[in-house]
Amino acid sequence: AFGISGVQKYTRALHDSSITGISPITEYLASLSTYNDQSITFALEDESYEIYVEDLKKDEKKDKVLLSYYESQHPSNESGDGVDGKMLMVTLSPTKDFWLHANNKEHSVELHKCEKPLPDQAFFVLHNMHSNCVSFECKTDPGVFIGVKDNHLALIKVDSSENLCTENILFKLSET
């Protein structure tokens, strides 16, 4: 549905989006897995958390993440199509006081301990570009998504509409 540089165009206004209210519209505890059904797991190592993408053994318990959903408002003069638009943004917290953060300089996804209000690096625009899968786009870096690289989460630049459905940026949410 995009032109040549569609991803850059449609995300241009993300920098200026304002999150309406400080409380989430809903929260949802779910396990996170890749399109290929590998689990996203979190391990405490040397007083910091590491994020892994791995196959779990049968009956091994999946790690849960608290997804907090916020509504973000675009005034029509920013949305580019004359319409006041709304989007869903999420924060992801696998354990109390820790949130996934986008480290745009290192192209990495990290767990940081922080207090509310959370920094913009902890917010991701929610997409469901593929049936029953979601993608997470950095609020601070439009066109950059959480993805899987070398069995870790990383930030992946998506430079064309075709790549929006590339499997390594697609995730499944499950309550089980």
């Epitope: 549905a1 809903t26 929610l126 469901n128």
Partner: antibody
């Protein structure tokens, strides 16, 4: 303002292909998904499929073998084709736009007025 | 597919009455439920999204509650223009199924 307008023949013969077009204005297909929904006379609503903002398409599996959804960005149009129709496909067909940018979680905020398609010989 | 069961299928009420419509999902859908109002010969109109959020321009007498599998639409004080059919819809996973509808009629 946001508008969606369905158009196409009101009468289709059994075994033929039903073709409808949804012409949109006031918003961009690169930001919002457009869905097709139908409603047989006197009955409830049935979701048929969606053209998502990224250009991917999801179908109702019950109709997947007969249904094709496509787009023409330059004309701001989304098309629906339903093949091998029978009398059971007689319905008002609606197109509708997502409430949220990039996702369908917020339901359908804007609807076309609907177009009645009758399948009869 | 997720089945959505609405009850009652119809309700007779008077202006000023409080009306409650319930929707039950066959599996958990989080908060991803919408409610629509449809009048004869018209397109559906979004009333509530994300289970509890009031859509733009919808009067505050409409409210939504619930999460997981059980959801409720409440009209606190029924007005003449509220006589219509109401549908719930789950948006957690495709196909995005609707309830069968609840017709609110004049008593």
């Amino acid at each position: 303002q946001v508008q969606l307008q369905e158009s196409g023949p009101g009468l289709v013969k059994p075994s033929e292909t039903l073709s409808l077009t949804c012409t949109v204005s006031g918003f961009s297909l690169s930001k919002y998904g457009v869905h097709w929904i139908r409603q047989p006379p006197g009955k409830g609503l049935e979701w048929l499929g969606v053209l998502r903002a990224g250009g991917t398409i999801s179908y109702n599996s019950a109709l997947m073998s007969r249904l094709t959804i496509s787009e023409d960005i330059s004309k701001s149009q989304v098309s629906l084709k339903l093949s091998s129709v029978t009398a059971a496909d007689t319905a008002v067909y609606y197109c509708a736009r997502d409430h949220y940018y990039y996702s369908s979680f917020g339901g359908f905020a804007s609807w076309g007025q609907g177009t009645l398609v009758t399948v009869s010989s | 597919d997720i089945q959505m069961t609405q009850s009652p299928s119809s309700v007779s009420a008077s202006v000023g009455d409080r009306v409650t419509i319930t929707c039950l999902a066959s599996q958990t859908i989080g908060a991803w439920l919408a409610w629509y109002q449809q009048k004869p010969g018209k397109s559906p109109k979004l009333l509530i999204y994300a289970a509890t959020r009031l859509a733009d321009g919808v009067p505050s007498r409409f409210s939504g509650s619930g999460s997981g599998t059980d959801f409720t639409l409440t009209i606190s004080s029924l007005q003449p223009e509220d006589f219509a059919t109401y549908y719930c819809q789950q948006l957690n996973s495709t196909p995005y199924t609707f309830g069968q509808g609840t017709k609110v009629e004049i008593k």
